[in-house]
Amino acid sequence: FKVATPYSLYVCPEGQNVTLTCRLLGPVDKGHDVTFYKTWYRSSRGEVQTCSERRPIRNLTFQDLHLHHGGHQAANTSHDLAQRHGLESASDHHGNFSITMRNLTLLDSGLYCCLVVEIRHHHSEHRVHGAMELQVQTGKDAPSNCVVYPSSSQDSENITAA
């Protein structure tokens, strides 16, 4: 399977909410011995290997934000810790995988990475990631609502094994 990022850039005004999205593409094994670990973290521009650096999102690490489930099951993060930080990650039956960030501030600007790990019990794991940028803007030339920039077809299909 692969991960697609429908949008490479989200530009939002302060105070807005945004949902960053990744999508699983290709065949997904729904066997009993296969589970999926999905999570989000921040990274840095300039890395030769995109998403190689893992930084917390609003002080929550990728372990705090992870989802763990089988096949195309739906899942949400545990509400307490994440929601206290204005965050919620979710996964649906169609392979969509997202993180919602509420009440954006300038501090939220940065490069965000989704990570999906397919774990086969007693076997190796397969991991892929997608990257997108969030820019929170201020002042008179900030947009009134979030503006999204679609990934080029090459971007959205271009996934690097982590």
Epitope: R45, V48, A131, K140, A142
Partner: antibody, heavy 119, light 105 residues
């Protein structure tokens, strides 16, 4: 209109540090990535890194990581690039350049600052 | 890391001639841009996203290509076009080609 005005030429000794400034005007400073690109005499362009003034998020070329620091002062709409442990091969013109949102290209450039490293 | 290779390194032509500059990437890139630089000046954006003409740039300049191979074409050279041209890409990090010097024959 958008303007990027850089500080003047510097002469430094090997091992020293240099701090170059780039003052922005004509747009909302916090909303656009600012990059630093250098050019050694007779050579091509080399990307060093960038800073997002809204929250000081940075991204550096691995080649310069540990030696370069980019900062900003929102009160004066100025970004700074400090390069430490200078060597003779750091002699170059250093440019700041604004990245247009959503494009990944540089639409405005500073005039350049010549940094000479010589003993 | 994606490496951009420009060819030729130097191109000698006369005013009125057509110039074709190439930029090749070691792997597929999302965005390719072209800049012009004259001696003692900062670079100036010519073409963005492979084929779009930047503001104020004459229509004799054009860009094409996708994936790993890109071309900058100047249909009929004017005296002020003799300069160094750089291609530039972003795919998580930024790199420039080494430049093509366009000189008067």
């Amino acid at each position: 209109q958008v303007q990027l005005v850089q500080s003047g030429a510097e002469v430094k000794k090997p091992g020293a540090s240099v701090k170059v400034s780039c003052k922005a005007s004509g747009y909302t400073f916090a909303n656009f990535w600012m990059h630093w690109v250098r050019q050694a005499p007779g050579q091509g362009l080399e990307w060093m890194g960038a800073i997002f003034p809204g929250n000081s998020d940075t991204g550096y070329n691995q080649k310069f990581k540990g030696r370069v620091t980019m900062t900003r002062d929102t009160s004066t709409s100025t970004v700074y690039m400090e390069l430490s442990s200078l060597r003779s091969e750091d002699t170059a013109v250093y440019y700041c350049a604004r990245e247009l949102t959503g494009t990944y290209y540089f639409d405005y450039w500073g005039q350049g600052t010549l940094v000479t490293v010589s003993s | 890391e994606i490496v951009l290779t420009q060819s030729p390194a130097t191109l000698s032509l006369s005013p009125g001639e057509r110039a074709t500059l190439s930029c090749s990437a070691t792997s597929s890139v999302s965005y390719m841009h072209w800049y012009q630089q004259k001696p003692g000046q900062a670079p100036r954006l010519l073409i963005y996203s492979s084929s779009n003409l930047a503001s104020g740039i004459p229509a004799r300049f054009s860009g094409s290509g996708s994936g790993t191979d890109f071309t900058l074409t100047i249909s009929s050279l004017e005296p002020e076009d003799f300069a160094v041209y750089y291609c530039h890409q972003w795919s998580g990090h930024f790199t420039f080609g080494q430049g093509t010097k366009l000189e008067i024959k």
